[in-house]
């Protein structure tokens, strides 16, 4: 076309899809009349007439445009619609009087692609393969035009790189006309890349400038063969028996190679493999001394069938032997003295100590413990406790009983009871002494005894309240080879008086009814009266 | 006939580098562990390199470690030694060796070998 | 590291006659689990690759003529030529391969 050369540039319009662009005839008065104007798009350098404007009055041309034009801005404005892709084009309009001028105007169209899909390799990269593998796809939809992709690593681009680094990147065309972005990203990793996080990002553009989009990070799976094996116990620090141990066995290769963990037996030299778990790893519960030893792991890369043994690791569980008493059983006369010393092993240093039974009031610290001058009450339970001060709860106990010679040594001189007629009565005596003494009564009646401890006996009589009873009262007798000791029990008829609330002498009162021949509570509560003298 | 035919010795200035490469024929290269074995002059067996059947796992002694890659072509029955930063002491000849289908680790067949000599 | 001795460096023995190399390792190679040795013996004669002879410490390799026995377990293990012949002349290596993989120094087998 003659003069075509001599033609300004189009104005430029930029429209989003979707949106309506207003498309702005810039016909100045004297080169057209703007109530007399034929639009035309330009597709290919074919013109197509789309729409006419005769006295102000626009009219759509039959075709592609014909539903989505209108005027605006008296006339001088031509909207379209619901722009596309395939709207991206020039349009110009062309004025009729008073000469015929035009007037071009190239629209640009712009869309966002959706967030990018970043899509690993899940079968994952040998690091010494040959030429760079696929490491993940990204993939940028519904954009336009095409959107430029970067891909990175550890928040560093990627730039394509001779055997390292390949950016394979191809689009496809929807029937909407906006592009699918498909970028392959293809690199020789190295074993440091294990934690690498890649992802892609997506440079646009629209109206409003220039915008990007980023995926989400990911790793890929690196594997590489384990070059070194090694032994974790927990829990770290200083083990005890009873505790769970847990050998673990680890490797630095991907995937993990198969595993086996021995222990060393001393006498053979020879490595006994161990029963793991499926995950590879000992539990020793509760953990022994015997458990104690050098284990180590061996691991199996079945691709190369090479072999690998990590360093061995001392394993010491800490231990405190049974408890050793001498004399075990011992027996004294009083006055006497007594000396107890206690023993025991421990794969640490013990720290001793010897308690009162009856009180745990901490008698000595140290393996030995002297008594003088032995008194009765001297007789009962002594605990000495072996302990590992440096590692809390690991100690063993043993108890030893004194035992005091002596005749017997009732519980109570005097006893009064409560009792109804009748009623069946459940009486007990309690005496102690060594030898153990044995315990008769003076009454018939069903009797049993138990024995409390070695040096401890207490008898129940059951007997049947008569008046002789509660005339004579009943005695029990405690005998052994060195003398013998007596206990009375004063019964006493129940009266209303008696059962004031606020009396206080009916705390030996059966709680069961008087019927005749009833049993009453056979561990009924009994008041010891006063007893200046002394007991036994 | 299981072949295997080293090639790639020769004399070389230390700290320089040189190719090895075997040949394999005779059975399906692509489905066995290969690796390279030496031996100095007048000294004891020295393993070099292992390689798994796909090339993805490879192993070095800690002599030949980070100076010494092994690899493979599958689709050319190939196996390489590259070894760069050679010293004296890797003076030797090399034997490419091929394991058998056992549980354990074994050189089943080993080729004739080929002599490398660092010396300046 | 293993380390693996042999003993002697070198053996002369008549045709015939009985060859005994003993071959030690810093460390058992028994597998306690499958009760297996990870041990190897290998024959190099002059001028010649080696050759696969044994392996798991006494399982002959196909084509390995019965003459040829292993035997030991743990750290100690020996190879045997029951009668010695002209074409055992050979070092004779052990190798383990327990963890990596490390041969010992040879034994020289020669006919008085």
């Known amino acids: 076309v003659p003069g075509e050369a001599e033609q300004p540039a189009p104005e430029l319009v930029e429209v989003e899809v979707g949106s309506t662009a207003l498309l702005k005839c810039g016909l100045s008065q004297s080169q057209g009349n703007l109530s007399h104007v034929d639009w035309f798009s330009v597709h290919k350098e074919k013109r197509t007439l789309i729409f006419r404007v005769r006295q102000g009055q626009g009219q759509s041309e039959p075709g592609e445009y014909e539903q989505r034009l209108s005027l605006q801005d008296r006339g001088a404005t031509l909207a379209l619609t619901q722009v596309t892709p395939q709207d991206e084009r020039i349009f110009l309009c062309q004025g009729k009087r008073p000469r015929s001028q035009e007037y071009r105007i190239q629209l640009r169209v712009y869309k966002a692609p959706e967030e990018p899909n970043i899509q690993v390799n899940p079968l994952g990269i040998p690091v010494n393969s040959k030429e760079p593998e696929e490491v993940a796809t990204c993939v940028g939809r519904n954009g336009y035009p095409i959107p430029q992709v970067i891909w990175y690593k550890n928040g560093r681009p990627l730039k394509e790189e001779k055997n390292r680094v390949h950016i394979q990147s191809s689009q496809t065309v929807e029937s909407s006309g906006l592009y699918t972005l498909q970028s392959i990203l293809k690199a020789q990793l190295v074993k440091e890349d294990k934690d690498a996080q890649f992802y892609c990002e997506l440079n646009y553009r629209l109206p409003s400038g220039n915008h990007m989009k980023e995926s989400r990070e990911v790793t890929v799976p690196v594997f590489y063969p384990t070059e070194k094996v090694w032994l974790e116990v927990e829990p770290v620090g200083m083990l005890k028996e009873g505790d769970r141990v847990e050998i673990r066995c680890l490797a630095d290769g991907n995937p993990p190679p198969h595993f086996s963990i021995s222990k060393g037996n001393p006498s053979t030299r020879e490595a006994e493999e161990e029963t793991t778990n499926d995950n590879g790893v000992l539990v020793l519960e509760p953990a022994r001394k015997e458990h104690s030893g050098r284990y180590e792991c061996q691991a199996w890369n079945l691709d190369t069938m090479i072999s690998l043994l990590s360093e061995p690791q001392e394993l010491l569980v800490n231990y405190v032997s049974d408890v050793r008493v001498s004399p075990a059983a011992p027996e004294r006369q009083e006055g006497s003295s007594l000396t107890l010393t206690c023993e025991a092993e421990s794969s640490q240093d013990l720290e001793f100590q010897w308690l009162r039974e009856e009180t745990d009031q901490v008698l000595e610290r140290g393996p030995v413990l002297q008594l003088h001058d032995l008194k009765r009450e001297a007789g009962g339970g002594y605990r000495c406790v072996a302990s590992v001060p440096s590692i809390p709860g690991l100690n063993r106990t043993q108890l030893v009983k004194l035992a005091i010679f002596g005749p017997p040594w009732m519980a109570f001189k005097e006893r009064k009871v409560w009792v109804k007629e009748n009623m069946v009565l459940n009486l007990s005596c309690e005496a102690s002494g060594h030898p153990r003494p044995t315990i008769s009564w003076n009454v018939n009646g069903t009797a049993s005894e138990g024995d409390q401890d070695p040096q401890r006996v207490l008898s129940t009589l059951n007997v049947l309240v008569t008046p002789e009873l509660l005339e004579t009262g009943v005695e029990c007798t405690a005998s052994n080879d060195l003398g013998k000791n007596t206990s009375i029990l004063f019964l006493e008829l129940v009266n209303l008086t008696t059962l004031t609330p606020d009396s206080n002498t009916t705390t030996g009162l059966s709680t069961s009814t008087a019927s005749p021949h009833t049993r009453a509570n056979s561990t009924s509560t009994e008041r010891k009266l006063p007893e200046p003298e002394s007991r036994g | 006939e299981v072949q295997l035919v080293e090639s790639g010795g020769g004399l070389v200035q230390p700290g320089g580098s040189l190719r090895l490469s075997c040949a394999a024929s005779g059975f399906t290269f692509s489905s066995y562990i290969m690796s390279w074995v030496r031996q100095a002059p007048g000294k004891r067996l020295e393993w070099v390199a292992t390689i798994s059947s796909g090339g993805s796992s490879t192993y070095y002694p800690d002599s030949v470690k980070g100076r010494f890659t092994i690899s493979r072509d599958n689709a050319k029955n190939s196996l390489y030694l590259q070894m760069n930063s050679l010293r004296a002491e890797d003076t030797a000849v090399y034997y490419c060796?091929?394991?058998?289908?056992?549980?354990?680790?074994?050189?089943?067949?080993w080729g004739q070998g080929t002599m490398v000599t660092v010396s300046s | 590291d293993i380390v693996m001795t042999q003993s002697p460096d070198s053996l002369a023995v008549s045709l015939g006659e009985r060859a005994t190399i003993n071959c030690k390792s810093s460390r058992s190679l028994l597998n306690s689990r499958i009760r297996k040795n990870y041990l190897a013996w290998y024959q190099q004669k002059p001028g010649q690759p080696p050759k696969l002879l044994i392996y798991?410490?006494?399982t002959r390799e196909s084509g390995v003529p019965d003459r040829f026995t292993g035997s030991g377990s743990g750290t100690d293990f020996t190879l045997t030529i029951s009668s010695l012949q002209a074409e055992d002349v050979a070092v004779y290596y052990c190798?383990?391969?327990?963890?990596?993989?490390?041969f010992g120094q040879g034994t020289k087998v020669e006919i008085k």
């Open positions: 190798k383990q391969s327990y963890n990596l993989l490390t």
């Open positions: 798991w410490a006494s």
């Open positions: 060796t091929r394991d058998d289908d056992y549980d354990v680790k074994v050189f089943a067949y």
